[in-house]
């Protein structure tokens, strides 16, 4: 019988008492084979973290700063359940740390030196740790003691709780730096008042502060937010303009063997029986003998943290950067305006080799990071381990939901002004063998299908979106008799046709021979009935253009396209016989790297792009003999996006809507994790 006990860690006598009450009340409402609570008392949160890591306890609820400590080695804990605030319909699990300024003040985030600052309090998250952590490398040296460096950075501050004797500049705007509400500029509302009164130029608070202090929209319109990309936005656009997104209060557990499902089962049942307004005799979110015991008194319930979400992703790049800067105190030698090398994310072995060659030829401008799947690459870009990669539109959607931005688009048509003219897109098509003359769009059920990969545009999102509208369910593996859709569950019939050996079978990378456009077409040639690819795939792999043994004798005339009206047409008639127009692949990055990725990639394509005529000895960025490594092989150039610089604008309303509809069929654990952070 598996042990269904969750050992909760308590950090005080009062918490231990509440924990025992929690244990006893859960016993009275949960069947004997259900989860139960045991209580472990420790002296501090850090002791609880260590106890969980050592398997002496299982769970504790922590604020964001401690979630960071819990994640660090050797603890390696992960977030498993989040408290939420507000309503069940609109649950808030995060708040946003923001920098508020007056509308007419005219400076940006990178011009804060010499300004007057208002803080909620020394050592507090939104008011000190996050802004000072993010500004850390701009502070004058020596950066220790930190208070002195901050005092020398701003021309005057109010940082309640600071030592006014040692650091008088930190108390210049609020004499005495009182550490309670007796100081009119203390806390969130106080820091905002400091700005409002004209004492300071910028207030570091949380996103709700301005709404709580100014009920009138006209009054709020006198203020703006400073964004990390050195722009400003209205105060209600805090989701797109903040210093960091911070989780409020989170249950953590071990990453391996951490009982996360059991902890969720326990807390989910606990909130059903003892949550807000559920029971008089015991209340989960109430602390008669103290404040915020075990859980925050202001919490309204719990939400399960998606399993794909580790602490780094949960806390977010900006928060982790800020806290790491403060804790480790390391900065690059001399901060310069020059761009650091761009860390390109390469998928598996073959892309890594091409990336390495690019790195050697770029003489240090490009560095390479490897991952096994596109989603792993996106996650690495999110957390700063990598900076950029080029993605199919379906993954541009996921990357966008995860906060990344498109920066350049692949262009596939030769034109005089390639880099200035992003194209409308390519065509997603369904290809069949000419010999299978009875096959049409309307009788694909039970046939064998070949897909570039799950989540990709031409190979999945477009055909499966159209199919979903027809069959109204997500069981595509039952619709087709078998197929190869790399990235499917290994036991799915949509992995049956794949050719990868061992663990590489059905993997969404080049280790699976039927991966990508060329792979899906090869799958059709060798085993399948229909391949979902781009309109250029057939001509690129027939007529001797692909020298590989399986392709060298293929003839374009032996293949036809399925049209949505139930007819068929020759391959060259794709403009009148396609499933949909697909957005071109695009390079994505984090917002903070946008300018540098843009600059370095434009330099790189001038050196190694389509202007290189002999690829036998020279490095060619857009060539890999039909393997589409790093970029599509038919890329002519990387084009500026102009104003299409968000994933929604880049992909277009129609495609975003189509992928949104297919979301209910999504198996993307990353998309689930990212929509948890930003629903």
């Amino acid at each position: 019988v598996p042990d269904k006990t969750v050992r909760w860690c308590a950090v005080s006598e009062h918490e231990a008492t509440k924990c025992q009450s929690f244990r006893d009340h859960m016993k009275s409402v949960i069947p004997s084979d259900g989860p139960s609570v045991a209580c472990v008392k420790k002296a501090s949160y850090l002791d609880c973290i260590r106890a969980i890591a050592a398997n002496e306890a299982d769970a504790v609820t922590l604020d964001a700063g401690l979630v960071y400590d819990a994640y660090l080695a050797p603890n390696n804990l992960k977030p498993v359940v989040a408290e939420f605030y507000g309503s069940k319909e609109d649950p808030q699990t995060f708040y946003y740390a923001v920098a508020v300024v007056k509308k007419d003040s005219g400076f940006q985030m990178n011009q804060l030196r010499g300004k007057k600052s208002c803080h909620t309090g020394l050592g507090r998250s939104a008011g000190w740790n996050i802004p000072i952590g993010l500004l850390y490398c701009d502070l004058p040296e020596p950066r220790k003691p930190l208070e002195k460096a901050v005092a020398n950075f701003f021309s005057g501050s109010c940082a309640p709780c600071a030592d006014g004797t040692d650091f008088p500049q930190l108390c210049q705007l609020c004499p005495g730096c009182g550490c309670s509400t007796l100081n009119q500029y203390f806390g969130y509302s106080g820091a905002f008042k400091c700005l409002k009164d004209g004492a300071g130029d910028v207030a570091f608070v949380k996103h709700s502060t301005i709404f709580e202090n100014l009920a009138n929209k006209a009054d709020r319109d006198q203020y703006e937010l400073l964004c990390l990309d050195n722009t400003r936005k209205p105060v209600d656009e805090y989701k797109d303009c903040h210093l960091a997104q911070v989780p409020s209060h989170t249950v953590v557990a071990r990453s391996m063997g951490g009982k996360e499902d059991l902890i969720w089962e326990l807390l989910n049942q606990a909130q059903e029986h003892f949550g807000k307004d559920k029971s008089k005799e015991f209340q989960l979110f109430s602390s008669p003998h103290g404040k915020d015991l075990l859980f925050k008194d202001s919490a309204h319930g719990f939400l399960k943290v998606p399993p794909r979400m580790d602490a780094k992703m949960y806390l977010g790049y900006e928060y982790v950067t800020a806290i790491r800067n403060l804790r480790e105190g390391t900065c690059p030698e001399a901060p310069t305006d020059e761009c650091k090398p761009v860390k390109w994310c390469a998928l598996s072995h073959h892309e890594r080799l091409k990336c390495d060659e690019w790195s050697v030829n770029s003489v240090g401008k490009i560095e390479c990071v490897s991952a096994e799947t596109t989603e792993d690459c996106i996650a690495k870009i999110m957390n700063g381990e990598a900076d950029a990669m080029s993605l199919d539109g379906g993954f541009v959607y996921i990357a966008g939901k995860c906060g990344l931005v498109p920066v350049l688009a692949e262009n596939y048509n030769k034109s005089d002004n390639c880099e200035d003219t992003p194209e409308a897109g390519y065509f997603a098509i369904a290809v069949v063998k000419k010999s299978a003359s009875d096959l049409t769009w309307d009788n694909l059920k039970g046939k064998k299908s070949c897909h570039t990969a799950v989540g990709r545009t031409a190979g999945w999102n477009i055909p499966m979106g159209l199919l979903y509208n027809k069959i109204n369910h997500c069981r595509f593996d039952e619709f087709f008799s078998e197929g190869c859709a790399p990235g499917s569950k290994k036991d799915s019939s949509l992995c049956k046709l794949c050719m990868g050996s061992g663990l590489n079978l059905c993997e969404p990378n080049n280790k699976e021979g039927y991966y990508g456009y060329t792979g899906a077409f090869r799958c059709l040639v060798e085993k399948g009935d229909v391949a979902f690819v781009k309109h250029q795939t057939v001509p690129q792999n027939t007529g001797g253009k692909n020298p590989d043994p399986w392709a060298k004798n293929l003839n374009e005339k032996d293949y036809e396209l399925l049209c949505l009206d139930g007819t068929r047409k020759p391959v060259e008639e794709y403009a009148n016989c396609h499933l949909a127009r697909a957005p071109n692949h695009a390079v994505v990055t984090r917002k903070d790297k946008e300018a540098c990725v843009h600059k370095i990639l434009r330099q790189q394509q001038h050196l190694f792009g389509s202007n290189v005529t002999d690829c036998s000895g020279n490095f060619c960025l857009f060539r890999s003999e039909t393997k589409d490594l790093l970029f599509r092989d038919d890329t002519v150039c990387l084009a500026k996006l102009h104003d299409r610089n968000t994933y929604e604008k880049y992909l277009g309303e129609e495609y975003v809507k189509a992928v949104g509809n297919l979301r209910k069929c999504s198996t993307s654990s990353l998309l689930e994790a990212c929509t948890f952070r930003r629903p």
Partner: nanobody
Framework: EVQLVESGGGLVQPGGSLRLSCAAS????????MAWYRQAPGKGLELVAG???????NYRDSVKGRFTISRDNSKNTLYLQMNSLRAEDTAVYYC???????????WGQGTLVTVSS
């Protein structure tokens, strides 16, 4: 068929030096970017140093200032001079010729470098 034969490995004490060679045949050596990779026990393959056809070089951070990559196009040979060797440099070293274009996987048998006192 490309053939790459590495030599020059051996056992050396920390702080010591070795010079690895890689003889290439059947490749378009003189116009290809070349590189040295290594694989430590239980670890993945990692790029150590690379050299372009024009002689521009690039090194992984941990070997910068200690290792030097060079090529002799007349002899179709690639070299890696390794100085101030450390225990963490212990690995099998392979050379590769990028003209094979990333997926034919032409690798030699490698040469083992062991740094130990």
């Amino acid at each position: 068929e490309v053939q790459l034969v590495e030599s020059g490995g051996g056992l050396v004490q920390p702080g010591g030096s070795l010079r690895l060679s890689c003889a290439a045949s059947g490749s378009i050596f003189s116009i290809a970017t070349m590189a040295w990779y290594r694989q430590a026990p239980g670890k993945g393959l990692e790029l150590v140093a690379g050299i372009t056809r024009s002689g521009s070089t690039n090194y992984r951070d941990s070997v910068k200032g200690r290792f030097t990559i060079s090529r002799d196009n007349s002899k179709n040979t690639l070299y890696l001079q390794m100085n101030s060797l450390r225990a963490e440099d212990t690995a099998v070293y392979y050379c590769t010729d990028y003209s094979s274009r990333y997926y034919h996987d032409y690798w030699g048998q490698g040469t083992l470098v062991t740094v130990s006192s």
